[in-house]
Amino acid sequence: MAVTACQGLGFVVSLIGIAGIIAATCMDQWSTQDLYNNPVTAVFNYQGLWRSCVRESSGFTECRGYFTLLGLPAMLQAVRALMIVGIVLGAIGLLVSIFALKCIRIGSMEDSAKANMTLTSGIMFIVSGLCAIAGVSVFANMLVTNFWMSTANMYTGMGGMVQTVQTRYTFGAALFVGWVAGGLTLIGGVMMCIACRGLAPEETNYKAVSYHASGHSVAYKPGGFKASTGFGSNTKNKKIYDGGARTEDEVQSYPSKHDYV
């Protein structure tokens, strides 16, 4: 029962997380104009992974897509890639985990198969969550770097009284959505991996078998060392799961004038 609950909860948490990762990836507010010195602005700039926008004080909003691939910063491309990989892995993980759910019966699928599928989806969720967290963190780091650079060069003199004020950007809502969503997906993945251990069919203890040696009547119970390997499958699972944890570390280390209503 606890296993089913853990698996179900893991699935739901991952589902919410992946929905959040998709939402964050699509959102336009990855970076927003810093309003620290000027809380009321006539033109409010904000940028996403796919387009940049301006909300005018008039109430109109206009967005422009990044219609180039080669002209975009490598970091932005990397963030896009990480988010897309996260979404794809998460989506596959969701698909696998649906079939792995203990409460869903598909033909005569064995528990061991369900356990393997649960583990697979769990690892996928973990990697998906890490991809999202990494993507958002890379973007946030990029913003922090640019923020201080633009603060240092806040006014670029153009001779005389003319000056170009650089627009400074700070963290947008999408970053927080991405971090939370990535975290949820990660937690969901861990829960799936934990559920997998409970799903794996435990090997039944071997019945005592008598071996008759000549002259002596000794009953060998292949339990001593062998019985301890009755948890072999679990230990094995744990190893795979630990491998998943190592994978986490590896992944983490990669850097007309209409009315507008």
């Epitope: 104009q33 000027n38 009321v40 602005t41 006539a42 033109v43 409010f44 700039n45 904000y46 940028q47 940049s52 926008c53 301006v54 005018e56 004080s57 008039s58 109430g59 109109f60 206009e62 967005c63 422009r64 003319v162 000056q163 170009t164 004020v165 627009t167 004038k257 009315d259 507008y260 209503v261």
Partner: antibody, heavy 118, light 113 residues
Framework: QVQLVQSGAEVKKPGASVKVSCKAS????????VNWVRQAPGQGLEWIGM????????RLNQQFKDKVTLTVDTSTSTVYMELSSLRSEDTAVYYC???????????WGQGTLVTVSS | DIVMTQSPDSLAVSLGERATINCLSS????????????LTWYQQKPGQPPKLLIY???TRDSGVPDRFTGSGSGVDFTLTISSVQAEDVAVYYC?????????FGQGTKLEIK
């Protein structure tokens, strides 16, 4: 068609107050900001501030913050600008205008001449 | 506040000739989000309210004749009337729509020679 009709000319004594109205028609009133601009005789244009009819949110030129109050009556699609503590230098034509894309002012009222004289 | 400086203060042009009015801003009016310049041009005839000609530095308002052209980016902008007509006699103003408070140039008076 879009129209902004302002109230008639006013003559006031220094220290008095005046309330100028701007009635909008021909468009969705609550979707657009309405702003106020003044023009002293023979002078250029000076932006006073703007108000959003849906929530009465305002943006005021700091120069006018103690002088001007902007209000809205959505039931009659009318925007009001009240000028207080009038002085002779407040003598000007006051225009209301709808704010369009690009923060441009696309439709203007005919203007209200406010004369401050003792 | 952004200071808008127009030149010349007045301009006399023969009918059919080209008229050019310049507007210099003390700060860039280019929005990074949509790469648009928040500069507007108005025409004001005597005894009338101003009329919107061009917004976003180069977008003509509906009903504005195509002899009126706006150009420029950043801090330097130009309004060009390719072939001046008698009805173009007016005062022309540029306006900053980029930051509060919105500010206007001092105006350029166009006359017929």
């Amino acid at each position: 068609q879009v129209q902004l009709v302002q109230s008639g000319a006013e003559v006031k004594k220094p220290g008095a107050s005046v309330k100028v109205s701007c009635k909008a028609s021909g468009y969705s009133f609550t979707n657009y900001w309405v702003n106020w601009v003044r023009q002293a005789p023979g002078q250029g244009l000076e932006w006073i501030g703007m108000v959003h009819p849906s929530g009465s949110e305002t943006r005021l030129n700091q120069q006018f913050k103690d002088k001007v109050t902007l209000t809205v009556d959505t039931s009659t699609s009318t925007v009001y600008m009240e000028l207080s503590s009038l002085r002779s230098e407040d003598t000007a034509v006051y225009y209301c205008a709808r704010v369009w894309s690009g923060n441009a002012f696309d439709y203007w009222g005919q203007g209200t001449l406010v004369t401050v004289s003792s | 506040d952004i200071v808008m400086t127009q030149s010349p203060d007045s301009l006399a042009v023969s009918l059919g000739e080209r008229a050019t009015i310049n507007c210099l801003s003390s700060q860039s009016l280019l929005a990074s989000g949509n790469q648009r310049n928040y500069l507007t041009w108005y025409q004001q005839k005597p005894g009338q309210p101003p009329k919107l000609l061009i917004y976003w530095a180069s977008t003509r308002d509906s009903g504005v004749p195509d002899r009126f052209t706006g150009s420029g980016s950043g801090v330097d902008f130009t309004l060009t009337i390719s072939s001046v007509q008698a009805e173009d006699v007016a005062v022309y103003y540029c306006q900053n729509g980029f930051s509060f408070p919105f500010t206007f140039g001092q105006g350029t008076k166009l006359e017929i020679k």
